[in-house]
């Protein structure tokens, strides 16, 4: 299996944005790569977002995706937006080298993203 590295822990910003790098050790010269972000919480795994891209080009997520990203060589910089405290969990980076054959699959150990909802601003008495 292809090795995929990602940070162990990331803290989301107060605006609910978390970014992390997913790096893969490519055994071949892939031209088309698919990156999927999976969320694992309470032993349930769900797909957060996925994008296919050409090496050297931008990642294209669906318009309604909460993810954006850029690629550079064998690194993918992923950003997940709109996160709330309930979204805290393990976010796993899955990389597939699709074309040309052969196919390679790599799954990272996951990045624990902590999301803390901002405290509401107290009402001001003037």
């Amino acid at each position: 299996a292809m090795h995929v590295a990602q940070p162990a822990v990331v803290l989301a910003s107060s605006r609910g944005i978390a970014s992390f790098v997913c790096e893969y050790a490519s055994p071949g010269k892939a031209t088309e790569v698919r990156v999927t972000v999976l969320r694992q919480a309470d032993s349930q795994v769900t797909e957060v977002c996925a994008a296919t891209y050409m090496m050297g080009n931008e990642l294209t997520f669906l318009d309604d995706s909460i993810c954006t990203g850029t690629s550079s060589g064998n690194q993918v910089n992923l950003t997940i937006q709109g996160l709330r405290a309930m979204d805290t969990g393990l976010y796993i980076c899955k990389v597939e080298l699709m074309y040309p054959p052969p196919y390679y699959l790599g799954i990272g150990n996951g990045t624990q993203i902590y999301v803390i909802d901002p405290e509401p601003c107290p009402d001001s008495d003037f």
């Epitope: 031209t31 088309e32 296919t52 699709m98 074309y99 054959p101």
Partner: antibody, heavy 118, light 107 residues
């Protein structure tokens, strides 16, 4: 039910051109790579070309590189093969096939016959 | 290119017989080996992919095995509807290549 229907074959003189089409239905076309495979009369199967689901990746057999162009229109659920500078050895039944992992052709159309002859 | 060599090129067997077709790749193709069935005058159909996984709707009398460069398609009990030409195909590297085919007939 997965259905692939080819059209566009016919008789053409050497050096001529043809454009094959393949209309797909019964599955989400934009989720799958597609391939063209041909079979000369009484012969075996020969892979011709492949295009990935979003058309990011396109590949051809060596003998077709520069002469054939594969393309797709995901909005129309259609696959195409533009064939130029046709030769007698291109005479065959051309099949369009759906291609998912592991680089296998899991569903095939009924084929369209291309005859190159003077 | 990876060459795929099938043997035998043709065979004749009785209904109920166990039939074995072999396919040899010119280099290691890992598990990217697929088998197709083409009945006379018909379109090829995927039988087996990833060496041994049956495609949907394929009877369990068909099975595949092998690894690396040597692979086998087995029909455990030949039926009249199995009369066809069988092709192996490698998906390990481009160009994807097929074996020459094995024509199976009933005695």
């Amino acid at each position: 039910e997965v259905q692939l229907v080819e059209s566009g074959g016919g008789l053409v003189k050497p050096g001529g051109s043809l454009r094959l089409s393949c209309a797909a239905s019964g599955f989400t076309f934009s989720d799958y790579g597609m391939a063209w495979v041909r079979q000369a009369p009484g012969k075996g199967l020969e892979w011709v070309s492949f295009i990935s689901n979003l058309a990011y990746s396109v590949y051809y057999a060596d003998t077709e590189t520069g002469r054939f162009t594969i393309s797709r229109d995901n909005a129309k659920n259609s696959l195409y093969l533009q064939m130029n500078s046709l030769r007698a050895e291109d005479t065959a039944v051309y099949y369009c096939a759906r291609s998912g992992l592991p680089y296998a052709m899991d569903y095939w159309g009924q084929g369209t016959t291309v005859t190159v002859s003077s | 290119d990876i060459q795929m060599t099938q043997s035998p090129s043709s065979l004749s067997a009785s209904v109920g017989d166990r039939v074995t077709i072999t396919c040899r790749a010119s280099q290691d193709i890992s598990n990217y080996l697929n088998w197709y069935q083409q009945k006379p005058g018909k379109v090829p159909k995927l039988l087996i992919y990833y060496i041994s996984r049956l495609h949907s709707g394929v009877p369990s009398r068909f099975s595949g095995s092998g690894s690396g460069t040597d692979f086998t398609l087995t029909i455990s009990s030949l039926q009249p509807e199995d009369v066809a030409t069988y092709f192996c195909q490698q998906g390990r590297m481009l160009p994807w290549t097929f074996g020459g085919g094995t024509k199976v007939e009933i005695k």
